[in-house]
Interface confidence: low
């Protein structure tokens, strides 16, 4: 008996061939001997089966001795043995219809779980193997689960169902809802304008939800909400904003925030959360602000940084075109009685120069004498 695998919702074509290459009488029946379809001369006739409106054949092939049974919009319950009767012969074809569906929505939040469920006909014992867009393989029986979805899991999952040495392939498009970056860091000199951007890693027709940015300043004992906003069909509207700092927010995606000026009291870490309509859970992006200040007070030249910095941090003070005068793994460096000229304060992290601030030191004779 020939075995054919089909996919739920698809169309399948079961073949039946006569030895005579001409149109002769044929019938397709199911295992209960109920007629599905056949012919009467050059006319297609249908029986009382449940497939009535979904069954068809190709009249153009009858003259060549081919009498296919076409079943559209396959259902799991279409799994059966189909019998073609032609020239006093019976050809049996076993059709097994499988379906593969995602547990809920195919749009899932980063960190959530994806469960794929296989629908299969009674008596079948299929095995399933799925391959993620980044090449991760998972195997299972009736259900397959992937916990902690990552951004790289977005895309087309290809699943192969194996039964009786035959296979059928399913493709499921999964969208992982996340920000492009889990974390970002902005380095600014004191007084500069700060731009925070929160690009999303997915595109959808309509995007509705609400969000909030909580900020933990390095100098503050507790965190506070800097801004809350709504998102309606990709349009952003601010609900509430603190008076200090007075943040501004862009009206379109990507989510964009502007801090008028970087000040030491704002240096710290923020967490932007976005709750999407009809989704449980929230999207998160961490954002960090590091602020640098270079000052000269009497005979002391000081460079300081505030905000979250890594253990590879190096702060240096150097006179332009000369080697570093002082270089430390600290958040403040200083030079007593600095020479006149343009001094540079450099913040480097793991060797990467992240921030640079220049300060001009005037010759001592041009500085008013302190009383």
């Amino acid at each position: 008996k020939k075995v054919v695998l089909g996919k739920k919702g698809d169309t399948v074509e079961l073949t039946c061939t006569a030895s005579q290459k001409k149109s002769i009488q044929f019938h397709w029946k199911n295992s209960n001997q109920i007629k599905i379809l056949g012919n009467q001369g050059s006319f297609l006739t249908k029986g009382p089966s449940k497939l009535n409106d979904r069954a068809d054949s190709r009249r153009s092939l009858w003259d060549q001795g081919n009498f296919p049974l076409i079943i559209k919009n396959l259902k799991i319950e279409d799994s059966d043995t189909y019998i073609c009767e032609v020239e006093d012969q019976k050809e049996e074809v076993q059709l097994l219809v499988f379906g593969l569906t995602a547990n809920s929505d195919t749009h899932l939040l980063q960190g959530q779980s994806l469960t794929l469920t296989l629908e299969s006909p009674p008596g079948s014992s299929p095995s399933v193997q799925c391959r993620s867009p980044r090449g991760k393989n998972i195997q299972g029986g009736k259900t397959l689960s992937v916990s902690q979805l990552e951004l790289q899991d977005s895309g087309t999952w290809t699943c192969t169902v194996l039964q009786n040495q035959k296979k059928v392939e399913f493709k499921i498009d999964i969208v992982v809802l996340a920000f492009q970056k889990a974390s970002s860091i902005v380095y600014k000199k004191e007084g500069e304008q700060v731009e925070f951007s929160f690009p999303l890693a997915f595109t959808v027709e309509k995007l509705t939800g609400s969000g909030e940015l909580w900020w933990q300043a390095e100098r503050a004992s507790s965190s506070k909400s800097w801004i809350t906003f709504d998102l309606k069909n990709k349009e952003v509207s601010v609900k509430r904003v603190t008076q200090d700092p007075k943040l501004q927010m862009g009206k379109k995606l990507p989510l964009h925030l502007t801090l008028p000026q970087a000040l030491p009291q704002y240096a710290g870490s923020g967490n932007l959360t976005l709750a999407l309509e009809a989704k449980t859970g929230k999207l998160h992006q961490e954002v960090n602000l590091v602020v640098m200040r270079a000052t000269q007070l009497q005979k002391n030249l000081t460079c300081e940084v505030w905000g979250p910095t890594s253990p590879k941090l190096m702060l240096s003070l150097k006179l332009e075109n000369k080697e570093a005068k002082v270089s430390k793994r600290e958040k403040a460096v200083w030079v007593l009685n600095p020479e006149a000229g343009m001094w540079q304060c450099l913040l480097s992290d793991s060797g990467q120069v992240l921030l640079e601030s220049n300060i001009k030191v005037l010759p001592t004779w041009s500085t008013p004498v302190q009383p």
């Epitope: 570093a324 430390k328 793994r329 540079q344 480097s348 060797g351 990467q352």
Partner: antibody
Framework: QVQLVQSGAEVKKPGSSVKVSCKAS????????INWVRQAPGQGLEWMGV????????LYAQSFQGRVTITADESTSTAYMELSSLRSEDTAVYYC??????WGQGTLVTVSS | DIVMTQSPLSLPVTPGEPASISCRSS???????????LDWYLQKPGQSPQLLIY???NRASGVPDRFSGSGSGTDFTLKISRVEAEDVGVYYC?????????FGQGTKLEIK
């Protein structure tokens, strides 16, 4: 992958200068320090100095102060170490190091009259 | 300058046996941020040094897990759980807390 390719071996006279080059590839050149470390024959490792190519900030070990100059050319992703007033005890293999993790193959400088 | 002192200077080991190298600094390498600024390097015969451990106890990428670093402040240890023939060479510790970075004098590991 990260590669640091150094210039070939040099033989120099005492009192002269040598300039060793280090061509970097496989990463963003301006994003990481280039350190220079030397090793005299059969001896240990000695740090000479460092440059941050993006800011051209340099820092030198006191023992080489005034004799060593480290520079970087962003356009060719190449760092240079020049050592002047050479003496016989400067005979060593000179290494360039990205950050402190990837090392060049080393350049042997021999100082001999 | 911070002075780094290693011991032993020579270490003969039987393959499959563990090995341990000690490194002492003349002042604490523990930064106020909680990290120890000490790195370990291996220089195999005829090769450039390679980074094994950074910030006291973090294995560099591609380094087998038989290598581990421990210690804090002024006393540090590099351990090899089971020595293999390919581990021969000179092991150096280096402090990266203050410039100039300074190295230990090196420990030569050889197979018995």
């Amino acid at each position: 992958q990260v590669q640091l390719v150094q210039s070939g071996a040099e033989v120099k006279k005492p009192g002269s200068s040598v300039k060793v080059s280090c061509k970097a590839s496989g990463y963003t050149f301006t994003s990481y320090d280039i350190n220079w470390v030397r090793q005299a024959p059969g001896q240990g490792l000695e740090w000479m100095g460092v440059i941050s190519p993006s800011g051209d900030a340099t820092l030198y070990a006191q023992s080489f102060q005034g004799r060593v100059t480290i520079t970087a050319d962003e356009s060719t992703s190449t760092a240079y170490m020049e050592l002047s007033s050479l003496r016989s005890e400067d005979t060593a293999v000179y290494y360039c190091v990205k950050g402190l993790d990837h090392w060049g193959q080393g350049t042997l400088v021999t100082v001999s009259s | 300058d911070i002075v780094m002192t290693q011991s032993p200077l020579s270490l003969p080991v039987t393959p499959g046996e563990p090995a341990s190298i000690s490194c002492r600094s003349s002042q604490s390498l523990l930064h106020s941020n909680g990290y120890n600024y000490l790195d370990w390097y291996l220089q195999k015969p005829g090769q450039s040094p390679q980074l094994l451990i950074y910030l006291g106890s973090n294995r560099a990428s591609g380094v087998p897990d038989r290598f581990s670093g421990s210690g804090s402040g002024t006393d540090f240890t590099l351990k090899i759980s089971r020595v293999e023939a390919e581990d021969v060479g000179v092991y150096y510790c280096m402090q990266a807390l203050q410039s100039p970075w300074t190295f230990g004098q090196g420990t030569k590991l050889e197979i018995k």
